[in-house]
Interface confidence: low
């Protein structure tokens, strides 16, 4: 017997559906109506036939009362080929829900997204996460998707993007966006970062994550941030193969004074990189290849420095007379 595609936990909190049959019984998903967290994985299916069975242009207001009654706050949709028209139809209906966090992963969006009708209401998300989502529209996908969202988005995560650079002139500002995560885009690089950080479109960013994005030097990242006018409080550059030295002919880049936390862990560093901010509250240099303790003049003025997992430290022990510099936690490097 084939297992049930959908499983709802005992608390009616989390519901996970895995539709792997070639012609799944989508009605099974109705058991998720009472769940707060819903995950739907479509097994790589092409959802084009769905368009024949639903009226994507129907007025979504007719479903408003039903949708408002749903408990879902977090929705994940994955592993499917989705016509843009169907995605838009879903977003229009979900606009009447209490959905706050939407995750799209392993999706191929085909066709172009129509413009938002005047009478339509946007989806009031606080968090949007995309992983390995490809769009037929290339660089304009963010602008097209953005028009279906209300401007209160606080968290945007884009991983394994096929086009991590955006068509900046089409993108509107994200006035409430405080966290931007572009991690796991290894082809991005510093120039790509410049293209992705559309100037003046991300005025409120406080947390910027750039793990595994092909960054080369902190100075290069500093330049890209300065060019875009982005001033994060926290910057994560971990899991990049960073160079410690700066091109001697390259001028110093002035870091924003707003930056107080910098993560340089798992960066393959054999010495503390040049060109760091002069003053930081938090600096994470754990799990690098530092063969000796950094000299004070190699470091920024820093309140909380993490050095665990470097060769010069015997795991689990602090430096003599410098115990306060280490968290004492032994990471698995």
């Amino acid at each position: 017997t084939t297992p049930e595609p959908c499983e709802l936990d005992d608390e009616d909190f989390r519901c996970v559906c895995n539709f792997s049959e070639p012609q799944p019984d989508w009605s099974e998903a109705f058991q998720c109506v009472s769940a707060v967290e819903v995950e739907i994985h479509a097994g790589g299916l092409n959802l084009e036939p769905f368009l024949k069975r639903v009226d994507a242009d129907a007025d979504p207001r007719q479903y408003a009362d039903t949708v408002k009654a749903l408990r879902v706050r977090r929705l994940t949709v994955g592993a499917a080929q989705v016509p843009a028209q169907l995605l838009v139809g879903a977003l229009r209906v979900l606009a009447y829900s209490r959905l706050k966090e939407l995750t799209l992963e392993d999706l191929k969006i085909t066709g172009t997204m129509p413009p938002l009708p005047l009478e339509a209401t946007g989806l009031a998300l606080s968090s949007l996460r995309l992983r390995n989502v490809s769009w037929a529209t290339g660089r304009s996908w963010l602008a097209e998707l953005q028009q279906w969202l209300k401007p209160g988005l606080k968290v945007l995560s884009i991983a394994q993007a096929h086009s991590p650079a955006f068509s900046c002139e089409q993108v509107r500002a994200f006035p409430a966006l405080t966290s931007l995560d572009l991690s796991d885009n290894p082809g991005l690089g510093e120039r790509g970062l410049m293209a992705a950080l559309c100037p003046h479109k991300f005025p409120a960013i406080q947390n910027l994550a750039l793990r595994n994005t092909g960054m080369e030097t902190p100075t290069g990242v500093c330049a890209a941030l300065a060019a875009a006018g982005v001033q994060p409080h926290s910057l994560d550059l971990s899991h990049n193969s960073l160079r410690a030295t700066v091109n001697p002919s390259a001028p110093r880049c002035m870091w924003s004074s707003a930056l107080n936390s910098l993560n340089l862990s798992f960066a393959g560093l054999e010495q503390v990189p040049k060109g760091l901010p002069a003053k930081l509250r938090v600096l994470d240099l754990s799990c690098n290849r530092l063969n000796r303790a950094p000299q004070p003049d190699e470091l920024p003025e820093v309140d909380n420095l993490t050095l665990d997992g470097n060769p010069f430290l015997v795991p689990g022990t602090a430096l003599p007379h410098e115990g306060s510099m280490n968290s004492g936690v032994v990471p698995a490097c």
Epitope: E190, A223, P251
Partner: nanobody, 122 residues
Framework: QVQLQESGGGSVQTGESLRLSCVAS????????MGWYRQTLGDQREMVAT???????RYADAVKGRFTISRDNAKSAVYLQMNSLNREDTAVYYC????????????????WGQGTQVTVSS
């Protein structure tokens, strides 16, 4: 200091072709959008074509299908291949680039070339 050096302008007959080149030099870190604009006497400068770092091009309606913009990121250069030229294409052509450059610190701003004259006569 950053400079944009244009070349390739000149006088041609209607229906002929020209290729304009523009190279950015100086303390350049990276170059964002690049483009070509033109201006006739007494008129506003108008966009002819622009191209972003990824190679996505935009054209003015008047030149679509006749002009092709391209760039070489390694050389910080932009080119404009102009085919089927007509008298309305007569103008001074200006190169434009959005450049992250190095002075005392990093800066990013638009730079303009000095312009190169293109004259099309019948």
């Amino acid at each position: 200091q950053v400079q944009l050096q244009e070349s390739g302008g000149g006088s041609v007959q209607t229906g002929e072709s020209l290729r304009l080149s523009c190279v950015a030099s100086g303390n350049i870190r990276s170059v964002g959008d690049m483009g070509w604009y033109r201006q006739t006497l007494g008129d506003q400068r108008e966009m002819v074509a622009t191209i972003d770092y990824g190679g996505v091009a935009r054209y003015a309606d008047a030149v679509k299908g006749r002009f092709t913009i391209s760039r070489d990121n390694a050389k910080s250069a932009v080119y404009l291949q102009m085919n089927s030229l007509n008298r309305e294409d007569t103008a001074v052509y200006y190169c434009n680039a959005d450049i992250l450059y190095k002075s005392d610190s990093y800066a990013r701003r638009e730079f303009w070339g000095q312009g190169t004259q293109v004259t099309v006569s019948s």
